[in-house]
């Protein structure tokens, strides 16, 4: 017998053909041989079946002989083998319903697991095979878990269902709630104004939460809150900023902050934390700022940086157009009496300049 | 370690006055937000009033407004509940509080001072 | 006023046992809910910021849940020295109000 696989909500049709291509007596029935529908004279009529009012025929097609039956809104429970009766044979096609859903909302948090859960009809063994839109591959049986959603799982999940070597495809959409980038840092020079920038991941059409940035500045001893915010239908309020430093913040997505200026004082990093409604649990992203400072004093030229960096980042003193240059994988590089002229200091990553900041020598006589 | 000590409170006639003092150390009491919070004997906790870091912005629950005020000097580390016109009512627990949590927590709070008001 | 209403006032429950405390806002307060746990004599100690998060130290049987009007303390395994008296407090708007505590006693 012919083998149908079908999704739950869909509409499968299940054929049955003639050998003489013209219209004829047919009838479809279930296995309990309850007549579902049939032909009487040129009308379609239904039988006492629960699939009656679900249930169809392609009348156009009668007079070619193709006795099709069309169920629509497929329940799990449509499962069963339908036979056709036609030409006094009868063919049977066994109709096997899955359904495929997640156990919870699909928007959901980075860090959030993810469960699909498969409905089958009794008796059937289907194997799931599921393809994240980042080209992950997930196995299972009845169900399909993700433990940690991370914000490439965004997207269209295509999961195949497979039974009897026939196969069906569900495509579920999972939105992964989070900021695009999970961590950013911003290099700036000494009294430069600072923007940060926390752009999202996902669009929702209302958007309402609540939000702080707690900041941990390298030279202070305990971290504390810069800025907390509300978040209503995509408009930011500002609830209660500290005083130093006197943070602005945009009153529309993506969620935008400015810092007046780059002080050694407020180097450090941040985390930014936003609560949604109808959530369970936060998003974050972390922030870092690394400030820099070139000062001359006395017979002294010093270049500093502030904040986090990596002990691969190198840090440099060179005077243009000169060969003369300073470098060390430290926070602070210092020249002893240095020539008149421009020097650059400079914070560079494998030859890349992070940041840079200029200072004049002036000759002393 | 956060300290925060309370003290002035006492026995005081209805129509009194009383001033309490709060204390504070091993902090940066300049940056942040203080509040006075108050328990009446075997009741709930009532938040009083808060003051931000300069003093320049000041709330206080409708019970208190206009008989209490809420002040602080940073050079000293300390922080004020000037408490005018008292009725039995706000006999209480008054307990000095930083806000410091995340989210505008009330993180460390003092041990607590009795204001009993009573003739 | 944002008028905060704790159930229930209290609870009788054993050493092991899931407790859960609920919190209504008379309005929406998003994430702005913390909650403390005071025990008698002493001062309360915060626990829960933004409605679900664990303050450092807090142990990790404790969990908040909730945004808006609608908020939930649980103590998944009940321990001797959680015997004490929770409250919730709004932090979205002055005055700052808080529930009238729920007592977790011994039974």
């Known amino acids: 017998k012919k083998v149908v696989l079908g999704k739950k909500g869909d509409t499968v049709e299940l054929t049955c053909n003639a050998s003489q291509k013209k219209n004829t007596q047919f009838h479809w029935k279930n296995s309990n041989q309850i007549k579902i529908l049939g032909i009487q004279g040129l009308f379609l009529t239904k039988g006492p079946s629960k699939l009656s009012d679900r249930a169809d025929s392609r009348k156009s097609l009668w007079d070619q002989g193709c006795f099709s039956m069309i169920i629509k809104n497929l329940k799990i429970e449509d499962s069963d083998t339908y036979i056709c009766e036609v030409e006094n044979k009868k063919e049977e096609v066994e109709l096997l319903v899955f359904g495929l859903t997640a156990n919870s909302d699909t928007h959901l948090l980075e860090g959030q697991s993810l469960t699909l859960t498969l409905e089958s009809p009794p008796g059937s063994s289907p194997s799931v095979k599921c393809r994240s839109p980042g080209g992950k591959n997930i196995q299972g049986g009845r169900t399909i878990s993700v433990p940690q959603l991370e914000r490439q799982d965004s997207g269209t999940w295509t999961c195949t269902v497979s039974q009897d070597q026939k196969t069906v495809e569900f495509k579920i959409d999972i939105v992964v709630l989070a900021f695009q980038k999970a961590s950013s840092t911003v290099y700036k020079k000494e009294g430069e104004q600072v923007e940060f920038s926390f752009p999202l991941a996902f669009t929702l059409e209302k958007l309402t939460g609540s939000g702080e940035l707690w900041w941990q500045a390298e030279r202070a001893s305990s971290s504390k809150s810069w800025i907390t915010f509300d978040l209503k239908n995509k408009e930011v309020s500002v609830k209660r900023v500290t005083q130093d430093p006197k943070l602005q913040m945009g009153k529309k997505l993506p969620l935008h902050l400015t810092l007046p200026q780059a002080l050694p004082q407020y180097a450090g990093s941040g985390n930014l934390t936003l609560a949604l409604e109808a959530k369970t649990g936060k998003l974050h992203q972390e922030v870092n700022l690394v400030v820099m400072r070139a000062t001359q004093f006395q017979e002294n030229l010093t270049c500093e940086v502030w904040g986090p960096t990596s002990p691969k980042l190198t840090l440099s003193l060179k005077l243009e157009n000169k060969g003369a240059t300073v470098s060390k994988q430290a926070k602070a590089v210092w020249v002893l009496n240095p020539e008149a002229g421009m020097w650059q200091c400079l914070l560079s990553d494998s030859g890349q300049v992070l940041l840079e900041s200029n200072i004049k020598v002036v000759p002393t006589w | 370690e956060v300290q925060l000590v309370e003290s002035g409170g006492g026995l005081v006639q209805p129509g009194g006055s009383l001033r309490l003092s709060c204390a504070a150390s091993g902090f940066t009491f300049s940056s942040y937000w203080m509040s006075w919070v108050r328990q009446a004997p075997g009741k709930g906790l009532e938040w009083v009033a808060n003051?931000?870091?300069?003093?320049?912005?000041?709330y206080y629950v409708d019970s208190v407004k206009g008989r209490f005020t809420i002040s602080r000097d940073n050079a000293k580390n300390s922080l004020y509940l000037q408490m005018n016109s008292l009725r039995a009512e706000d006999t209480a627990v008054y307990y000095c509080?930083?806000?410091?949590?995340?989210?505008?927590?009330?993180?460390?709070w003092g041990q607590g001072t009795l204001v009993t008001v009573s003739s | 006023d944002i008028q905060m209403t704790q159930s229930p006032s209290s609870v009788s429950a054993s050493v092991g046992d899931r407790v859960t405390i609920t919190c209504r806002a008379s309005?929406?307060?998003?994430?702005?809910l913390t909650w403390y746990q005071q025990k008698p004599g002493k001062a309360p100690k915060f626990l829960i910021y933004a409605a679900s998060s664990l303050q450092s130290g807090v142990p990790s049987r404790f969990s908040g849940s909730g945004f808006g009007t609608d908020f939930t303390l649980t103590i998944s395994s009940l321990q001797p020295e959680d015997f004490a008296t929770y409250y919730c407090?709004?932090?979205?708007?002055?005055?700052?109000?808080f529930g009238q505590g729920t007592k977790v006693e011994i039974k």
């Open positions: 509080v930083r806000e410091g949590g995340q989210w505008l927590a009330l993180d460390y």
């Open positions: 309005q929406g307060i998003s994430s702005w």
């Open positions: 407090q709004q932090a979205n708007s002055f005055p700052w109000t």
């Open positions: 003051i931000n870091q300069d003093g320049g912005e000041k």
